[in-house]
Amino acid sequence: KESCDVQLYIKRQSEHSILAGDPFELECPVKYCANRPHVTWCKLNGTTCVKLEDRQTSWKEEKNISFFILHFEPVLPNDNGSYRCSANFQSNLIESHSTTLYVTDVKSASERPSKDEMASRPWLLY
C-alpha cells in the first residue's frame, strides 16, 4: 500500500547553474493523495529559512505528481543561494532538502564560466 504522506522530491544537495538575466523556474515536485497541500518557498539565510512572500509561484499538474514552481523572471545576481520548499499537511510541516542556485552574472559569452568552472569556485563548495 502506497503511503499517503505528502512527499517533496528535491534531491539532497541538488545544484543549478543559471545565468543572471535569464528566466528560470525552480520546481518543487509534490506527491499527495487527496487534497493538495499548501506549499511555500523559502531562501536560506544561515540556519534560518526566510519565507518568500512576494514572489511569483504557480502549480503545474501532471498525472502522478504536481510541481510548485518558483519563478525567476529574470534571474538576478542576488538570487544566488539555497532554497527549500515546505508543505503544510495535517498540521505537520514537511520540508524538502535544500537546492542551491549558482548565479553567474551576465558577461560576454567568452567570459561566461562553464558549469565545470562554477563547480570549482571555493566559495561555493559548501
Epitope: R12, E15, S17, D116, A119
Partner: antibody, heavy 119, light 112 residues
C-alpha cells in the same frame, strides 16, 4: 534491481584522453546522482566527482578539476567520465556508482574499468 | 577536505569472533538536516566495492545482520559480531556530508 555496466579496459599513451561510459538500468537516472571513484593498483579509493543527471550539473574533487569531465545522457541512462592529459599515475580501475538522490536508499557500483597509461 | 582515518589498517580474526573497525573524521559529519552521512563499504578481493551501511547504522538490503554500525559526530565503528569466511575483504568508511566526498584508507580483514 539497479545495475551499472561500464565500458571495457583501455590502454592509453601519456598526454592523451580516455572516456569511460557507465550505463544504468533498473532506475530513472533523473532521481539519482552518478559518481566516479578510482582505485590505483593496491591502493585505496579516490572520489573524482559526481553529476546530477536531471540537470547536468557536475562537481569535482579539486585534484581533478579541469582534467576530468563528467557528463550524462538521460535518454540512454548513461554517464561518462573523460580524463585528459593522462599520466602514468592515472593508471587505475575507474568505478562509476549511482545512488538515490532523495533518501540514499541505494548505492550501486559498476564492475570497474581498468585504464592503463603507458608509453 | 574532511580527512577520514581508519584503525587498524589490518585485522586478523578467528572465525566466529567479533571484529571492530574504527573510523574517525577530521570534522563532524552531522549535516544541517540532522542526519549523519557516514557509509561503510566492503570490497572483496577482485571485486567492486559494495555498500554495507549508510547513515551510520542502516544496513543495505541483503546485508547479514552480523554487520552493524554505530557512532556520531566524528567517531564511528563497524562491527562484525561473528566473522565468517566470506567476510574476508577490505572495509572502507566514507563521508557523504560535504564535498569532496572522502574515504578512509581501508582496513583489511583477514581470517586467522
Amino acid at each position: 534491481q539497479v545495475q551499472l555496466v561500464q565500458s571495457g579496459a583501455e590502454v592509453k599513451k601519456p598526454g592523451s584522453s580516455v572516456k569511460v561510459s557507465c550505463k544504468a538500468s533498473g532506475v530513472n537516472i533523473k532521481d539519482t546522482y552518478m559518481y566516479w571513484v578510482r582505485q590505483a593498483p593496491g591502493q585505496g579509493l579516490e572520489w573524482i566527482g559526481r553529476i546530477d543527471p536531471a540537470n547536468g550539473y557536475a562537481r569535482y574533487a579539486q585534484k581533478f578539476q579541469g582534467r576530468a569531465t563528467i557528463t550524462a545522457d538521460e535518454s540512454t541512462s548513461t554517464a561518462y567520465m573523460e580524463l585528459s592529459s593522462l599520466r602514468s599515475e592515472d593508471t587505475a580501475v575507474y568505478y562509476c556508482a549511482v545512488y538515490d538522490g532523495y533518501y540514499e536508499s541505494f548505492d550501486v557500483w559498476g564492475q570497474g574499468t581498468l585504464v592503463t597509461v603507458s608509453s | 577536505d574532511i580527512v577520514m582515518t581508519q584503525s587498524p589498517d589490518s585485522l586478523a580474526v578467528s572465525l566466529g569472533e567479533r571484529a571492530t573497525i574504527n573510523c574517525k573524521s577530521s570534522q563532524s559529519l552531522l549535516d544541517s538536516d540532522g542526519k549523519t552521512y557516514l557509509n561503510w563499504l566492503q570490497q572483496k578481493p577482485g571485486q567492486s566495492p559494495k555498500r554495507l551501511i549508510y547513515l551510520v547504522s542502516k544496513l543495505d538490503s541483503g546485508v547479514p545482520d552480523r554487520f552493524s554500525g554505530s557512532g556520531s559526530g566524528t567517531d564511528f565503528t563497524l562491527t562484525i559480531s561473528s566473522v565468517q569466511a566470506e567476510d574476508l575483504a577490505v572495509y572502507y568508511c566514507w563521508q557523504g556530508t560535504l564535498f569532496p566526498r572522502t574515504f578512509g584508507q581501508g582496513t583489511k580483514l583477514e581470517i586467522k
